[in-house]
Amino acid sequence: QGGTRSPRCDCAGDFHKKIGLFCCRGCPAGHYLKAPCTEPCGNSTCLVCPQDTFLAWENHHNSECARCQACDEQASQVALENCSAVADTRCGCKPGWFVECQVSQCVSSSPFYCQPCLDCGALHRHTRLLCSRRDTDCGTCLPGFYEHGDGCVSCPTSTLGSCPERCAAVCGWRQMF
């Protein structure tokens, strides 16, 4: 007679899981399971994660919170977002630095170190793409500079210096013999 009824909650479903005697509802994000429920389909006793720990998942049955990661100072990392009860520390690079992945197949959780961004201005070049996820992409030489080899050379200030063809095109000087 008792077996003809449907179960009170789905123990294998998304919201309940058999913990100990009963199917218990999970804990919200930022909380850990202190004690399982004491009745069928009941609420577990859930407590807030202690400082420096977190749990990001909703409706979980974890009995302890995960330790917040510390950003790697040796790799010049900084905390972009501090750890909270519901989210881990988000490590990244400070302004003027970019992420250099330490593995070839780079994903968000891959180990990385921070590299200083190229200063296009110091190289006398235009900044084509600002440095953030990758190094700065520098463009052509700034006005008053011309391409010479790998770098930008300042236009001569007098007619006494030599001014090759590229120089003449950029600097407005005719080639001097």
């Epitope: 009824r5 179960p7 009170r8 100990g20 005697l21 069928p40």
Partner: antibody
Framework: EVQLVESGGDLVKPGGSLKLSCAAS????????MSWVRQTPEKILEWVAT????????YYPDNVKGRFTISRDNARNNLYLQMSHLRSEDTAIYYC???????????????WGQGTSVTVSS | DIVLTQSPASLVVSLGQRATISCRAS??????????LHWYQQTPGQPPKLLIY???NLESGVPARFSGSGSGTDFTLNIHPVEEEDVATYYC?????????FGRGTKLEIK
């Protein structure tokens, strides 16, 4: 045939400790939650402790919580009740019981041992 | 905690007559169609024995003269016709939530 045999009952002074054992046979012990229930000299039945099957979780009423510890040894088919800081009101016959349940999550004590007597007195 | 109140505390019935035992809970022990109330029989010198589970389900091997009914807070155990071997104390117990509790028992005697 399901059998539950308790042992370890004794006369003990208030504040003392005692460990009860229950030897189970005739069924797949590890697949069942198990309990201890006691019956006072006034014939009152009281639930004392339960241990679940699987990852063992333990449950106690407030009047024994922190003083009694239920445990199990699935390899030996044994159930235990460690009792400490005993009081005169813990005097009773202690029964080992098997908990039957199904997916509907009701529990009922379908088999009981013969009991072991615990007397707490100075 | 849910308190179970049994009445009467003792009962004297003639052989072949009906014995009716009541168990009242301080809070509903029923939910989603389930009545988490069970009945046990304890004969002198023996441990309790499960008679009826979930208010009305007869445990295997228990004679059909035993029956249970009720829901919510009011439950009844009926024995009809009463036989000599039914002399015992009868207890109700709930498993709706922890802590599980028992009634104080009803002692059945034959007139």
């Amino acid at each position: 045939e399901v059998q539950l045999v308790e042992s370890g009952g004794d006369l003990v002074k208030p504040g003392g400790s005692l460990k009860l054992s229950c030897a189970a046979s005739g069924f797949s012990f590890s697949a069942y939650a198990m309990s201890w229930v006691r019956q006072t000299p006034e014939k009152i039945l009281e639930w004392v402790a339960t241990i679940s099957d699987g990852d063992p979780y333990t449950y106690y009423p407030d009047n024994v919580k922190g003083r009694f510890t239920i445990s199990r040894d699935n390899a030996r088919n044994n159930l235990y009740l460690q009792m400490s800081h005993l009081r005169s009101e813990d005097t009773a016959i202690y029964y080992c019981t098997r908990e039957r349940n199904d997916y509907d999550q009701y529990y009922t004590m379908d088999y009981w041992g013969q009991g072991t007597s615990v007397t707490v007195s100075s | 905690d849910i308190v179970l109140t049994q009445s009467p505390a003792s009962l004297v019935v003639s052989l072949g007559q009906r014995a009716t035992i009541s168990c009242r809970a301080s809070k509903s022990v029923s939910t989603s169609g389930y009545n988490y109330l069970h009945w046990y029989q304890q004969t002198p010198g023996q441990p309790p024995k499960l008679l009826i589970y979930l208010a009305s389900n007869l445990e295997s091997g228990v004679p059909a003269r035993f029956s249970g009914s009720g829901s919510g807070t009011d439950f009844t155990l009926n024995i009809h016709p009463v036989e000599e071997e039914d002399v015992a104390t009868y207890y109700c117990q709930h498993s709706r939530e922890l802590p599980w509790t028992f009634g104080r028992g009803t002692k059945l005697e034959i007139k």
